[in-house]
Interface confidence: low
């Protein structure tokens, strides 16, 4: 027994109550005064937070009971006060004393990963033991009670590529991985409390591990032989054809450069198309069909950026053989660009210039061009390649036009080339907002002032980078309509309120409210909208749901009494 030094007559044990006990009353212990001789002459009382609701005391014996299920994670300690009173005199036998009830922990909380989602990036082919990420689980149970909050981690999914340190949650690589085979791994980690002993609770988390690329692949030609033809009249710089090497790496590691081997005449060169990584074989010197009708050259490809430690993967660069046949023939027109993207604001008048495309004859005679345009009747093209509008454009009808321009040589109409022209129509604020729907609005005869009659919203067909914002207002012209008022909710809706108490169906069966709606475009556009409000006999319920049928009769010329 424990005797309180300050209150020498009190005797009690240390009080503990296990959490989550399902019994209706659980005996915790006994409070007793050493003056109590057991003849039921004393009355014990319990005071403080939880007294009477969570804990009760037997007034005669001082036995304390828990009458509610307790949760240590919610509250681990209760501080209560005890009184003992002499029933005969009604006086306190001992001074009021404070005592503590501790809620003891049970293992009722599983470990949880609070930092989800876990995502990690690690270079492909990283050696065993490479750190990937650390996961941490938290357990709400009492760390000082047994192993309730002592966590062990283990790998549920991810073998044989990954391992987890049981006590730290550090994930490491246990086997080299090739990004070119698989670039993302989904690892599942389980955390168990009780150090994994029987009765342990567990939680899991998923870790998404992405492999970043290293330059462990060299570019390789998929074709060992290319055959190209070129007109003898082709100018210097003419593209003869494209060669393509493929590299399974990505980004900078896939960037490549082509070079020409075995070309003593120095007639050809290769430049790279940075967008497609294709090698474009171009003419460096003029060719003459009569002098030489074909050339044989060898091309080589290698990566632009190779780390020293990965150099062994790049020895013996891939090569391909190119045969260039020189032809004595006319060539079709060549457009300056493979495709064109032009822009024009909507609403421009007929005849507005959109832009110019240009094709040239690569042959020696430099034939003039004639242009034709297909794909839309909204545009036309002149002999200079200038595209003009034939109609006013409306972005809300079409924001993009996909046109095809065909160029033919005037001297040889068989020589035809085409290029795609994409025309983007930019938005201007040319649509005023309007009601988002047709409103069938009713107000009860017995409506109160300030009662909501209708909530309205608006729509606008214009494109908006920022969200549309609409502003609602009651038209100043609507001077005769003071029966209703409008409040802009500033969230693209407005509310119509009754501005008076009571309406008369016979005298004024219908009201027309003129509402202005403005948008936030530049310049702002405003529309005038009429809201028809019909008066309805709703009865005592003041519910307009039955008004639709009555309104129908009213519209047809009937009146319901």
């Amino acid at each position: 027994d424990y005797k309180d030094d300050d209150d020498k007559g009190w005797v009690w044990n240390q009080f503990f109550v296990p959490e989550e006990m399902n019994t209706t009353s659980h005996h915790i212990g006994q409070l007793r005064s050493d003056l109590d001789n057991g003849n039921n002459s004393f009355q014990y009382k319990l005071l403080g937070a939880g007294a009477g609701s969570t804990f009760i005391i037997d007034e005669r014996t001082g036995d304390i009971y828990a009458i509610q299920k307790l949760d240590r994670e919610e509250r681990s300690l209760y501080i209560l006060r005890a009184q003992v009173i002499d029933i005969a005199t009604g006086r306190a036998v001992e001074p009021e004393s404070e005592f503590v009830i501790k809620v003891s922990d049970i293992n009722d909380n599983e470990p949880r990963f609070l930092d989800e989602p876990y995502e990690a990036i690690v270079p492909e082919m990283s050696p065993e033991g490479t750190f990937v990420i650390k996961v941490t689980a938290n357990d709400a149970d009492d760390p000082s009670t047994g192993y309730h909050a002592r966590i062990l981690y283990n790998l549920e999914r991810g073998q044989p590529y990954f391992s987890v340190e049981p006590t730290t949650g550090v994930i490491r690589i246990s086997s080299k991985m090739d990004r070119e085979l698989q670039d993302t791994y989904c690892v599942i980690i389980q955390a168990k409390d009780m150090l994994g002993q029987p009765g342990a609770l567990s939680g899991t988390t998923t870790v998404s591990i992405k492999l970043s690329d290293i330059n462990d692949n060299k570019p390789i030609f998929k074709e060992s032989f290319y055959r190209f033809t070129i007109s003898e009249s082709a100018p210097i710089g003419t593209s003869i054809g494209k060669i393509m090497a493929y590299d399974d790496d990505i980004g900078e590691n896939a960037e490549m450069e082509y070079s020409i081997e075995d070309d003593d005449s120095k007639i050809f060169d290769i430049i790279i198309d940075n967008d497609t990584q294709e090698g474009i074989v171009i003419l460096k010197k003029k060719v003459d069909f009569e002098q030489q009708s074909y050339y044989g050259i060898r091309a080589k490809v290698k990566n632009c950026h190779v780390d020293e430690e990965l150099a062994p993967a790049h020895v013996n660069a891939s090569t391909t053989y190119i045969k260039v046949q020189v032809e004595d023939e006319d060539e079709p027109p060549v457009f300056l660009l493979p495709y064109y993207i032009l822009e024009i604001p909507e609403g421009k008048p007929y005849g507005t210039i959109v832009g110019t495309v240009s094709a040239t004859d690569p042959d020696r005679r430099q034939s003039p061009m004639r242009y034709y345009l297909t794909g839309s009747k909204m545009f036309d093209i002149n002999d200079n390649g200038t595209i003009i509008t034939t109609n006013m454009l409306d972005r809300e009808v079409s924001a993009w036009y996909n046109l095809t321009v065909t160029a033919t040589e005037t001297y040889n109409v068989q020589q035809i080339s085409s290029a795609h022209v994409y025309v983007q129509v930019f938005n201007i604020n040319d649509n005023a907002p309007e009601f988002s729907q047709f409103y069938e609005t009713y107000v009860c005869e017995n409506a109160e002032s300030g009662e909501i009659v209708q909530i309205i919203s608006a729509i606008d067909r214009d494109e908006s980078i920022e969200d549309h914002h609409f502003y609602f207002n009651h038209s100043l012209e609507d001077t005769n309509n003071s029966s209703f008022m409008l409040t802009d909710n500033q969230d693209n809706t407005a509310v119509i309120l009754s501005n008076r108490t009571g309406f008369n169906l016979k005298e004024e069966p219908v009201f027309y409210m003129i509402i202005l709606i403005a948008d936030n475009g530049i310049p702002s556009l405003t529309s005038t909208n009429t809201l028809t409000i019909q008066v309805c006999d709703c009865g005592d319920s003041r519910n307009t749901e039955t008004c639709a049928n009555k309104g129908l009769l009213f519209i047809m010329g009937f009146r319901t009494e």
Epitope: G251, N274, D275, L337, E343, I465, E466
Partner: antibody, heavy 120, light 111 residues
Framework: QVQLVQSGAEVKKPGASVKVSCKAS????????IHWVRQAPGQGLEWMGI????????RYAQKFQGRVTMTRDTSTSTVFMELSSLRSEDTAVYYC?????????????WGQGTLVTVSS | QSALTQPPSATGTPGQRVTISCSGS????????VNWYQQLPGTAPKVLIY???QRPSGVPDRFSGSKSGTSASLAISGLQSEDEADYYC???????????FGGGTKLTVLG
């Protein structure tokens, strides 16, 4: 109104790291990219990288790969740019700028800039 | 050195028209929109022209932009003393997967 407010000037020693913050307000934080651009004294503008505040994914300019880390805290609508292994040539004004909803759209709002001085 | 090429300086007198050029490649200007930024002394840059030729509200119509092939230009007519600033062109580069800027042009308004 849209505002990007950056943290104050910093003086750092070579080899150290600096973390600059950029607090956004006046718009939906997760709807627009945030870019970081720096400007050395008397020099031009240099793009460092981009962060998507919606998911936190990043793309860094090749020059800064491995040295720069961009993060965000959606609860405070703040983006952070940390540059490590500082050298004297990193002395610059660092700007955050709001990009569009596409990578290639212009920067419509800029922070006031944060001067980072690297000196032994 | 910058991926986009601008003249380092330009001068003009009040009322004059000045043009600043910006040259790039097929992977940046050739394939993407060009934007122009004005940086007044001691301040952060601000967008002057976006998507080749669009002006944000508040930018006077004295400023105009154009693009042709892999080049772009900024024209300032009716030059004013408050136009004295640094001007930068910028474009997204598909090859670099990032933004590239011009080296900047310092505009001086004489007199």
């Amino acid at each position: 109104q849209v505002q990007l407010v950056q943290s104050g000037a910093e003086v750092k020693k070579p080899g150290a790291s600096v973390k600059v913050s950029c607090k956004a307000s006046g718009y939906t934080f997760t709807s627009y990219y945030i870019h970081w651009v720096r400007q050395a004294p008397g020099q031009g503008l240099e793009w460092m990288g981009i962060i998507n505040p919606s998911g936190g994914s990043t793309r860094y300019a090749q020059k800064f790969q491995g040295r720069v880390t961009m993060t965000r805290d959606t609860s405070t609508s703040t983006v952070f740019m940390e540059l490590s292994s500082l050298r004297s040539e990193d002395t610059a004004v660092y700007y955050c700028a709001r990009g569009g909803i596409q990578l290639w759209l212009h920067f419509d709002y800029w922070g006031q800039g944060t001067l980072v001085t690297v000196s032994s | 050195q910058s991926a986009l090429t601008q003249p380092p300086s330009a001068t003009g007198t009040p009322g004059q028209r000045v043009t600043i050029s910006c040259s790039g490649s097929s992977s940046n200007i050739g394939r993407n929109f060009v934007n122009w930024y004005q940086q007044l002394p001691g301040t952060a840059p601000k967008v002057l022209i976006y998507t080749n030729n669009q002006r944000p509200s508040g930018v006077p119509d004295r400023f105009s932009g154009s693009k042709s092939g892999t080049s772009a230009s900024l024209a300032i007519s009716g030059l004013q003393s408050e136009d004295e600033a640094d001007y930068y062109c910028a474009a997204w580069d598909d090859s670099l997967n990032g933004w590239v800027f011009g080296g900047g042009t310092k505009l001086t308004v004489l007199g």
